[in-house]
Amino acid sequence: AGVFELQIHSFGPGPGPGAPRSPCSARLPCRLFFRVCLKPGLSEEAAESPCALGAALSARGPVYTEQPGAPAPDLPLPDGLLQVPFRDAWPGTFSFIIETWREELGDQIGGPAWSLLARVAGRRRLAAGGPWARDIQRAGAWELRFSYRARCEPPAVGTACTRLCRPRSAPSRCGPGLRPCAPLEDECEAPLVCRAGCSPEHGFCEQPGECRCLEGWTGPLCTVPVSTSSCLSPRGPSSATTGCLVPGPGPCDGNPCANGGSCSETPRSFECTCPRGFYGLRCEVSGVTCADGPCFNGGLCVGGADPDSAYICHCPPGFQGSNCEKRVDRCSLQPCRNGGLCLDLGHALRCRCRAGFAGPRCEHDLDDCAGRACANGGTCVEGGGAHRCSCALGFGGRDCRERADPCAARPCAHGGRCYAHFSGLVCACAPGYMGARCEFPVHPDGASALPAAPPGLRPGDPQRYL
């Protein structure tokens, strides 16, 4: 048993052009939180499959409001580690998905809204009990910097947290073949059932049924000495009592090689022989090969035959990213109608609709004319998430149910008097004006500005507006 620990160092715009827009704004403040999902690394599982090793959610980060005009900085992060406890052995190779989520804190109906900002993924080799491993992953224009480690929970120890520690039975030393439990030097490894016949003095095991030899011994049961000399290290000052050369401090003391690397001395320094999946001077860099199966979602891995050569994932349709862990930005096609906000959740697209619209793509207008009648001969006109009635003459109001006063707007020009009429309004024009709204002056010579007065009407007569 043990705990996988993840420390997020920064989340912000990556290098290069095309800095991302800040996820928060003065109108819509937000805060970040993170989710980590762990799976045994050699299993071929899609990004959406269960987190077999465990998952954890961070606390919410501080509320952030964008400064207008400023570039998106590294965003404020939640405090503390993300911890994923594991009950069984640590698998050594694991896959991870780290998601950055945004919680919008504006006036949301029904509470805050969450949306996925970025998702990174990878497969790594990691020995429990080792140092923090640092990593940088990019998701689109965003960059996530983080460290991680796996540590065993007492009494478990070892690279897989399968060895057990127990308090010492004797105050001075541990029993044959058992070592002190670093860092708990006052405890000893509990004996495991090693391979039958494994030397109790010169052999030990980290897994049941194996037999690993202490320095100076070899063979399947650690019964064959490497050298007949009892002095195994020809270095350092001579010991007068034994005649042996007692080892002095060397560059490999304390084993500077991380992640299970083995140290060998060179004339000037030391050299680490790294296990598969790690490289660097001290095996501190985790390198992933195609054998580790780094491509998610059915991606095809090419190259990367050894840890020093890069692998490339050729992704199937709909997926992208260095590990095929990200879905293509389907929202760029703007599938949401009527101003709806598009959210690509991976397994599905979601549209957050504006008020007045509904449906999976905001295609239903809740305020449309369907089922709505405009009274008194009015006609319904849709638009902008609302409906309105274009009313027949003499009626007004939202549904044309109110009798309109046609004279309220003072439609008669030049001092004409307005009279309401069943079919509209009538203007009685002041002397010198004519027309339906008294808009035309009568010329002094008696000729109208109109080509001709309609038959039966003399200038100055009331003009009925039909």
């Epitope: 709909g318 697209l349 793509r361």
Partner: nanobody
Framework: EVQLVESGGGEVQPGGSLRLSCAAS????????MGWYREAPGKQRELVAG???????KYAESVKGRFTISRDNAKNTVYLQMSSLRAEDTAVYYC??????????????WGQGTLVTVKP
């Protein structure tokens, strides 16, 4: 299930033209949005051109004035007319469609892709 079948890809010289077609078939109630994405080696897939859910046309900045998207609603088909092709247009072009399979169920579908190579 909905199928998208692309055609029209091929090799062309810089400055040349190609016309891509994408036909949707299967249990289609209506097509909400439909368009073309492309993926060049080592680059992320990007939208080239498409008809949005609101029926508007949308183009990537890099293809405006050179590419034209059109559709035949009766045939559930979209076309991408590509002119003045450049080496940087070399990519696998994928058709994408957001399709209502009934009044209240909508899903996203991808075609298998068609390769467009622009080289002298």
């Amino acid at each position: 299930e909905v199928q998208l079948v692309e055609s029209g890809g091929g090799e062309v010289q810089p400055g040349g033209s190609l016309r891509l077609s994408c036909a949707a078939s299967g249990s289609i109630f209506s097509i909400n949005a439909m368009g073309w994405y492309r993926e060049a080696p080592g680059k992320q897939r990007e939208l080239v051109a498409g008809f949005t859910g609101d029926g508007m046309t949308k183009y990537a900045e890099s293809v405006k004035g050179r590419f034209t998207i059109s559709r035949d609603n009766a045939k559930n088909t979209v076309y991408l007319q590509m002119s003045s092709l450049r080496a940087e247009d070399t990519a696998v072009y994928y058709c994408a469609a957001d399709v209502f399979t009934d009044r209240d169920h909508v899903d996203w579908y991808w075609g298998q892709g068609t390769l467009v190579t622009v080289k002298p």
